[in-house]
Interface confidence: medium
């Protein structure tokens, strides 16, 4: 889910959850598994 | 079907508190950020809060910050908003609504039909 | 705050005739190459419902009668063609910075 990372902004909260969600994406792994393997 | 219905709307005495829900049903609730906008009678809309999906992050403007407080319970696909200190110009119809996802930041997608806050002595 | 100026604050348009909306921001809602503006159509007695997000982009089930443009400061919501189940009062939203804000509306109605 997104919660992952905290900025002061909310739509720059969301750019990065977007740039995270797409590098899970590219690296082959769900991004749930990514998020919750850390 | 993706539906959201909001409950706890009321008449209330100014300096009084009440707390909304809104049950969430037909998509993985956990999964997506929510928000609270009201509309006032016969007035526009307004951004009342923002929480994250699964709940550690919050937002409001300074016009219900320290006042309102929006929480989630993703075991029961519910969201709430406590409402304390109420004021008359909170008088509104509160609408609980869905956030689209990663790359859509702000826009809501899926609406509840309201509940109605009336604040007045 | 961001102000969102709307304009006009109604509009009365023939049956098939083009209905244009504008919406200007104090301040720019882009960032990062995106442009955090969405579009909200409300019937009477009805909640809001999304029409346009990212400045442009159709959500699911809109009709292509509808677009949405612009950049920065100055955004327009076009209904093409328009019908008689668009008349409504439209909403721009900015949420790019907080506090989010909207627009104070537009009321769409049948000439």
């Known amino acids: 889910h997104s919660d992952g990372i905290f900025t002061d902004s909310y739509s720059r909260y969301r750019k990065q959850m977007a740039v995270k969600k797409y590098l899970a994406a590219v690296l082959g792994k769900r991004y749930k598994q990514r998020v919750k393997n850390k | 079907e993706v539906q959201l219905v909001e409950s706890g709307g009321g008449l209330v005495k100014p300096g009084g508190s009440l707390r909304l829900s809104c049950a969430a049903s037909?998509?993985?609730?956990?999964?997506?950020?929510m928000s609270w906008v009201r509309q006032a009678p016969g007035k526009g809309l307004e951004w009342v809060a923002t929480?994250?999906?699964?709940?550690?992050?919050?937002w409001y403007p300074d016009s219900v910050k320290g006042r309102f407080t929006i929480s989630r319970d993703n075991a029961k696909n519910s969201l709430y908003l406590q409402m304390n200190s109420l004021r008359a110009e909170d008088t509104a119809v509160y609408y609980c609504?869905?956030?689209?996802?990663?790359?859509?930041?702000?826009?809501?997608?899926?609406w509840g039909q309201g509940t109605t806050v009336t604040v007045s002595s | 705050d961001i102000v969102m100026t709307q304009s006009p604050d109604s509009l009365a348009v023939s049956l098939g005739e083009r209905a244009t909306i504008n919406c200007k921001a104090s301040?720019?809602?882009?960032?990062?190459?995106?442009?955090?503006m969405t579009w909200y159509q409300q019937k009477p007695g009805q909640p809001p419902k999304l029409l346009i997000y990212a400045a442009s982009n159709l959500d699911s089930g809109v009709p292509d009668r509808f677009s949405g443009s612009g950049s920065g400061t100055d955004f327009t919501l076009t209904i093409s063609s328009l019908q008689a189940e668009d008349v409504a009062v439209y909403y721009c939203?900015?949420?790019?910075?907080?506090?989010?804000?909207f627009g104070g509306g537009t009321k769409v109605e049948i000439k």
């Open positions: 301040q720019s809602v882009d960032y990062d190459g995106d442009s955090y």
């Open positions: 037909g998509f993985a609730f956990n999964n997506y950020d």
């Open positions: 609504a869905r956030l689209t996802g990663y790359d859509q930041a702000g826009a809501m997608d899926y």
């Open positions: 939203q900015q949420s790019n910075e907080d506090p989010w804000t």
């Open positions: 929480i994250t999906g699964g709940g550690s992050y919050t």
